[in-house]
């Protein structure tokens, strides 16, 4: 169950929840924001303060690390084969250092198997974060420190930090070093959603959501 | 430098089994994903497995699979290719191949192949 | 499965040519396209991987390009040592697969 199901069966307070895949007895603990745009929503990353290293393994990226309350990636296995048993929408939140916000809503959103490398798959973008996708299209398969996957010479994920779905390397990576304010400008390693802020604005938050297209 | 050495190749009647061999040097060996990929003689280029770094992940092409069985020892820097079932249509140089990465699906560098012959 | 169809099958060319190979899959492969040399009796040797990007040690006078379906790989001085027969694969998903081939011969 997701956090979508949390909340149909009456929970409907902000906080960390444990999930389970359907057929399975395998849990994760996640964050639920059970109040934005009608609740509901499982977080599947989350960037707030630096606190957690996000240069982690391919292994670390497939199970998830981090804390839900906090910073944390909810992990590629998991959110994969959630996407995979019905149809999910990608909500990406984000927050620059001058106290504005925007959003890109996919309405479509699921991650292949570790077959192809946890591959993304977007479909119908809308919101305020920009009109292109700062995500490449068609999506490429997820690249981490040691799990070389981009279609570069020069090593994105090496290079810009943090575990993402790169192409060479693309206009986003919301997974890259965490700046503080007056240092997150002409960053080319930061926290990038290029659509939005451009190729060196480093930003203050981003928060990574998924729920049922249906709930 | 990267060298990939392939043995055990050799003349194997229809229906028989062999095992063929590969020692990597020249690099992290347990960093790498590995691929088996095979030529009949004068023709193409087939593909047929690839092993994750760590041995997790295996993945078989369709003529192949449920008779081919790639593992590895990371300890021995040793890749391997077992045979069952063999055809005629087996018969090709067996090329042991590394990927560029943990599982890129890239062909990155090559061995230089070992030859099975299926005759009776 | 992804079919990959390789032309010409074979060409002939002189020292000097300029030589155009072309391979089309049957589905949006997504730049997932790598280029292989292969000389007579030798294991193949990787050229070009991600559709344009050379690799280490290959001279710039091999170049790839393409997107979607179709993709090229020129050579833009044909010296003795091209005459061999390239393979194109994608490795765009599983199972990979490999053209057919092209044979390029000195005329």
């Known amino acids: 169950r997701d956090c979508a199901e949390v909340f149909k069966s009456g929970h409907t307070t902000n906080g960390v929840y444990t999930l389970t895949l359907p057929n399975s007895t395998e849990e994760v603990k996640a964050y639920c924001d059970m109040e934005a745009g009608g609740g509901g929503w499982t977080i599947i990353q989350r960037r707030e303060d630096g606190s957690v290293d996000f240069q982690r393994t391919w292994k670390e990226y497939k199970v998830g690390f981090g804390n839900p309350s906090g910073e944390y990636w909810l992990g590629n296995e998991f959110v994969s084969q959630l996407t995979n048993q019905q149809r999910y929408v990608l909500k990406i939140h984000l927050k620059d250092w001058e106290g504005n916000e925007a959003y890109s809503l996919y309405e479509h959103f699921y991650l292949s198997s570790e077959e192809l490398n946890y591959r993304i798959h977007l479909k119908g973008l809308t919101g305020t974060a920009g009109k292109i996708s700062s995500i490449s299209q068609p999506g490429n398969d997820f690249s981490t420190k040691d799990a070389d996957n981009d279609k570069c010479i020069c090593k994105c994920s090496q290079m810009l930090t943090g575990g993402w779905w790169f192409d060479a390397c693309g206009p986003s990576n919301l997974n890259g070093m965490y700046y503080p304010q007056r240092q997150n400008t002409n960053k080319f390693n930061g926290i990038k959603w290029y659509y939005w802020k451009g190729s060196g604005y480093s930003l203050k938050g981003t928060t990574m959501m998924i729920r049922p297209a249906d709930f | 430098q990267v060298k990939l050495v392939e043995s055990g190749g050799g003349v194997v009647q229809p229906g028989r089994s062999l095992r063929v061999s590969c020692a990597a040097s020249g690099f992290t060996f347990s960093s790498y994903g590995m691929h088996w990929v095979r030529q009949a003689p004068g023709k193409g280029l087939e593909w047929l497995a690839i092993i994750w770094y760590d041995g997790d992940n295996k993945y078989y092409s369709d003529s192949v699979k449920g008779r081919f069985t790639i593992s590895r020892d990371n300890s021995k820097n040793t890749l391997y290719l077992q045979m069952n079932s063999l055809r005629a249509e087996d018969t090709a140089e067996y090329y042991c191949?590394?990927?560029?990465?943990?599982?890129?699906?890239?062909?990155?560098?090559w061995g230089q192949g070992t030859l099975v012959t299926v005759s009776s | 499965d992804i079919q990959m169809t390789q032309s010409p099958s074979s060409l002939s060319a002189s020292i000097g040519d300029r030589v155009t190979i072309t391979c089309r899959a049957t589905q949006d492969i997504n730049n997932y396209l790598a280029w292989f040399q292969q000389k007579p009796g030798k294991a193949p040797k990787s050229l070009i991987y991600?559709?344009?990007n050379l690799q280490s040690g290959v001279p710039s006078k091999f170049s790839g390009s393409g997107s979607g379906t179709d993709y090229t790989l020129t050579i833009s001085s044909l010296q003795p040592e091209d005459f061999s027969t390239y393979y194109c694969q994608q490795y765009h998903s599983y199972p990979l697969t490999f053209g057919g081939g092209t044979k390029v011969e000195i005329k």
């Open positions: 191949v590394r990927d560029a990465s943990i599982a890129s699906r890239f062909l990155d560098y």
């Open positions: 991600a559709t344009s």
